[in-house]
Amino acid sequence: AVNGTSQFTCFYNSRANISCVWSQDGALQDTSCQVHAWPDRRRWNQTCELLPVSQASWACNLILGAPDSQKLTTVDIVTLRVLCREGVRWRVMAIQDFKPFENLRLMAPISLQVVHVETHRCNISWEISQASHYFERHLEFEARTLSPGHTWEEAPLLTLKQKQEWICLETLTPDTQYEFQVRVKPLQGEFTTWSPWSQPLAFRTKPAALGKDT
């Protein structure tokens, strides 16, 4: 038998993916484990094999269909179980009644691009990926800019409290290399969390014109 504390956390990307992480102190690395999804009002079940991500945690993605298909709604409840093989039997290691739209984590924003850049400012746009139409405009964003000589953790967070898929960065230094990231979060859901940060977008401000006051 496996003893120790267990944590089973899952998030729905709002379309067709439930990502799960299971942590178990004292679990055996060699054990084969599955996450099993049993919706209360759907005709499908889904499993994914948990793969090790560290010494005591495993992860997998329940892929429910094509990436942009709407597979669950606000009224769905999905029973999620972790089952691990013990000899010829399967033992339930963790279980939760999962409400998808209370546990949202969207995909990172994509297609970041510089729309316009000047000496002191830069206009950047992006797109959201695989986000449910149910949200309409009820999304918020956080953005951060990496300046030379600083770390991402030191970068101040810019908050956009509406569905605005662009930003105008100001008070930038001329002829300077920057990086930019953005993340998204629905307003809905008690346990909803921020998406991962987008891939960084590198850009450079224009040099100040010689002989001109900048």
């Epitope: 084969s32 599955q34 099993h36 499908w44 079940n45 889904q46 499993t47 994914c48 094999e49 793969l51 997998c60 892929i63 429910l64 269909g65 094509a66 990436p67 089952l83 399967w90």
Partner: nanobody, 123 residues
Framework: QVQLVESGGRLVQAGGSLRLSCVVS????????MAWFRQAPGKEREFVAV????????EYVGSVKGRFTVSRDNAKNTVYLQMNNLKPEDTAVYYC????????????????WGQGTQVTVSS
């Protein structure tokens, strides 16, 4: 709806080898646990091997352990059955099966099926 197409079956001598392939289309391949079954003339369809969605874990019926290897290539939407040291009792139509639920795939009922490929092992 998911479609499965098997290939690679033929007449082979006892002790020989074959590799069966099954190409899956019509849905996201990595959703599916994949399995091979076989049906000999006048017998029930029987489970042969299964491979999980990630490809990390495989299981086999006792009579083929050590001789058959199931694998999958998620980039090619294909599952394989490598059959070595074939015996006359391996003669059957081999079927590829898909199910989104690992725990249901052996029960036959709710699987998606290919049309089968004939394997004949002569002594």
């Amino acid at each position: 709806q998911v479609q499965l197409v098997e290939s690679g079956g033929r007449l082979v001598q006892a002790g020989g080898s074959l590799r069966l392939s099954c190409v899956v289309s019509g849905d996201v391949f990595v959703r599916y646990t994949m399995a091979w079954f076989r049906q000999a003339p006048g017998k029930e369809r029987e489970f042969v091997a299964v491979v999980t969605d990630s490809g990390r874990t495989t299981e086999y019926v006792g009579s083929v352990k050590g001789r058959f290897t199931v694998s999958r290539d998620n980039a090619k939407n294909t599952v394989y059955l490598q059959m070595n040291n074939l015996k006359p009792e391996d003669t059957a139509v081999y079927y590829c099966a898909a199910n989104t639920d690992y725990f249901q795939i052996r029960s036959v009922d709710n699987n998606a099926w290919g049309q089968g490929t004939q394997v004949t092992v002569s002594s």
